[in-house]
């Protein structure tokens, strides 16, 4: 697994470099997680033919994965920094149970799946420092999460492969939207 942002040898070798601002750190953290997702997607695509499936076919699923909508204030039209930040943090917290599901889904990239999970936690902490209105954030209910995880793990092999693919794709899209929005803040 690649080393987390700020821990590569280049950072050690360049003590004169300015420390990263909070926005730069968040940007770097998201890009690091996206790299991890790419590696996981590579293993998934090599293992199954899910990646060739059309978006329409994959849309027929009952997963309630977090998704950016116009009302979330993260798009250029109707952009609202605080509403958007709340959406990003809430969405990342909702993704956590799906990242937990991914932990036993990889053979050669097991470490990478763990790195994505842990790096997402770090990202949430960075973003929380930036948010003014934490009261607006609803954290997932553990009881609901537990029954969701049980349900996902009870699926047949084909559905589990599809679920893995959908989680990775949705998480990638959510992070990309978040990255674009955060660059406007």
């Amino acid at each position: 697994a690649p080393v987390p942002p700020g821990e590569d040898s280049k950072d050690v070798a360049a003590p004169h470099r300015q420390p990263l601002t909070s926005s730069e750190r968040i940007d770097k953290q998201i890009r690091y997680i996206l790299d991890g997702i790419s590696a996981l997607r590579k293993e998934t695509c090599n293992k199954s033919n899910m990646c060739e499936s059309s978006k329409e076919a994959l849309a027929e699923n009952n997963l309630n994965l977090p998704k950016m909508a116009e009302k979330d204030g993260c798009f250029q039209s109707g952009f609202n920094e605080e509403t958007c930040l709340v959406k990003i943090i809430t969405g990342l917290l909702e993704f956590e149970v799906y990242l937990e599901y991914l932990q036993n889904r990889f053979e050669s990239s097991e470490e990478q799946a763990r790195a994505v999970q842990m790096s997402t936690k770090v990202l949430i902490q960075f973003l929380q420092k930036k948010a003014k209105n934490l009261d607006a954030i609803t954290t997932p209910d553990p009881t609901t999460n537990a029954s969701l995880l049980t349900k996902l793990q009870a699926q047949n092999q084909w559905l589990q492969d599809m679920t893995t693919h959908l989680i990775l794709r949705s998480f990638k899209e959510f992070l990309q939207s978040s990255l674009r929005a955060l660059r406007q803040m």
Partner: nanobody
Framework: AVQLVESGGGLVQAGSSLRLSCAAS????????MGWFRQPPGKVREFVGR???????NYADSVKGRFTISRDNNKNTVYLQMNRLKPEDTAVYYC????????????WGQGTQVTVSS
């Protein structure tokens, strides 16, 4: 598994305050979420509030603005600060821990009695 022990309950007058503690022992204390629940006499157990691993709190509507949950990871303890108590807050209060994102509340305390008299 984590062992949870609640303390701080008692008999108080309506309008007063009380702070409950939930001390954890056992495994390293960094659960995904810690929750407070209560069971009023003759009723089912109900959700009071929770605090997640990053410190974000959520509350039941009935206690919002009156109750506050906090945690001290150095002391392996979670607190429930209860202000402006009402007779309908009378219940046995339980704390619970969810060790991972998908585990549900997998550890529960024995409960502490809170009685609010009018």
């Amino acid at each position: 598994a984590v062992q949870l022990v609640e303390s701080g309950g008692g008999l108080v007058q309506a309008g007063s305050s009380l702070r409950l503690s939930c001390a954890a022992s056992g495994r390293t204390f960094s659960p995904y979420t810690m929750g407070w629940f209560r069971q009023p006499p003759g009723k089912v157990r109900e959700f009071v509030g929770r605090i997640n691993w990053s410190g974000i709190t959520n509350y039941a509507d009935s206690v919002k603005g009156r109750f506050t949950i906090s945690r001290d990871n150095n002391k392996n303890t979670v607190y429930l600060q209860m202000n402006r108590l009402k007779p309908e807050d009378t219940a046995v209060y339980y704390c619970a821990a969810a060790s991972r994102s998908g585990s549900g509340y997998d550890s529960w305390g024995q409960g502490t009695q809170v009685t609010v008299s009018s």
